[in-house]
């Protein structure tokens, strides 16, 4: 369960792929589309508000039933819109919604690298946000060896 309804911190950052393509958001026909693209040299990067939440993780090992904490994040590129995992369609979508946010808007934050993060679906463990055909998609990672595959690694930058 997520500890408290307030994030422990919030962080405004641009999101890019391991290969330095930018994640951008465009309003089209009253809904937002998500793109993965190369930006021109001085083109401004879109920012995303990452809200960090603590989540207790139940344990088989420790006596008090709690083994440790995970960091969950929500990602919001614009007011009232959040990235959502659509597990049926294996897609990542932007949905307008009110708080409390649904579980589909929460992602477990992983550091696979000192400077890269990955986002695992809260609703579907082992499934991560990834890049497929210049779009964001949900990608199943079947073993720990594949956790370092470049298409699920993202960089966060304040600039």
């Amino acid at each position: 369960s997520i500890t408290g309804i307030s994030p422990i911190t919030e962080y405004l950052a641009s999101l890019s792929t391991y290969n330095d393509q930018s994640i951008t958001f465009a309003l089209e026909d009253e809904s937002y589309e998500i793109y993965v693209e190369d930006l021109k040299k001085d083109e401004k990067k879109d920012k995303v508000l990452l809200s960090y939440y603590e989540s207790q993780h139940p344990s088989n090992e420790s006596g008090d039933g709690v083994d440790g904490k995970m960091l969950m994040v929500t990602l919001s590129p614009t007011k009232d819109f959040w990235l959502h995992a659509n597990n049926k369609e294996h897609s990542v979508e932007l949905h307008k919604c009110e708080k409390p946010l649904p579980d589909q808007a929460f992602f477990v934050l992983h550091n696979m690298h000192s400077n890269c993060v990955s986002f695992e679906c809260k609703t579907d463990p082992g499934v991560f946000i990834g890049v497929k055909d210049n779009h964001l998609a949900l990608i199943k990672v079947d073993s720990s060896e594949n956790l370092c595959t470049e298409n699920i690694l993202f960089k966060l930058s304040e600039t």
Epitope: Y52, H57, G68, L109, N111, M112
Partner: antibody, heavy 122, light 107 residues
């Protein structure tokens, strides 16, 4: 109860090698980044090495890069630090530490071992 | 590398005093800033993480604040068991770096 127990410290000559071990218990070891931090006598804390929870990534400061190697055996709940080409300035208490969150480096080090002393001297 | 400059390096205070220790970073970063307490011959103990979050089991007289480059640890009413050395640490960018420490002594 989380426990981290270091071993393998001792007296070694300059240029020599030493392998430190850290036995972890009381938590799901393979879900956490692990880090070695050292403290020279009467001095501050210095980061030495970190390893991802899978073991696939390792990170070092310039002061030990190329000489020290961090590794882990998730099946044995153990963390290691192989130290080669030791110098007098590597003399310190070496602490094994665990990250605060699963899968992640954020949030400092809530758990530390008791430390093991490494003395590099001729 | 991000340099963490702690001040003061030492201070003398009495039981009941309000004590403030600052940590200045050479460049700004997200709030992945931790504070530790260390007593002679003991391992460091995490007090504060995420700049202002109190670690489980740490008394509420300890608090942290700040963002960007300026961070502060405050002990609202110093207790006898608080005489120790305090370190800040940034975890936002590698290499991870610690402040030089602040020794809190009895006046």
């Amino acid at each position: 109860e989380v426990q981290l127990v270091e071993s393998g410290g001792g007296l070694v000559q300059p240029g020599g090698s030493l392998r430190l071990s850290c036995a972890a218990s009381g938590f799901t070891f393979n879900n956490y980044w692990m880090t070695w931090v050292r403290q020279a006598p009467g001095k501050g804390l210095e980061w030495v090495a970190s390893i991802t929870y899978t073991g696939g990534g390792t990170y070092y400061p310039d002061s030990v890069k190329g000489r020290f190697t961090i590794s882990r055996d998730n099946a044995k709940n153990s963390l290691y630090l192989q130290m080669n080409s030791l110098r007098a300035e590597d003399t310190a208490v070496y602490y094994c530490t665990r990250a605060n969150y699963y899968y992640n480096t954020y949030g400092g080090f809530p758990y530390w071992g008791q430390g093991t002393l490494v003395t590099v001297s001729s | 590398d991000i340099q963490m400059t702690q001040s003061p390096s030492s201070l003398s205070a009495s039981v009941g005093d309000r004590v403030t220790i600052t940590c200045l970073a050479s460049e700004g970063f997200s709030n992945d800033l931790a504070w530790y307490q260390q007593k002679p011959g003991k391992s460091p103990k995490l007090l504060i993480y995420a700049a202002s979050r109190l670690q489980d089991g740490v008394p509420s007289r300890f608090s942290g604040s700040g963002s960007g480059t300026d961070f502060t640890l405050t002990i609202s009413s110093l207790q006898p068991e608080d005489f120790a050395t305090y370190f800040c640490q940034q975890g936002s960018k590698y290499p991870l770096t610690f402040g030089g420490g602040t020794k809190v002594e009895i006046k």
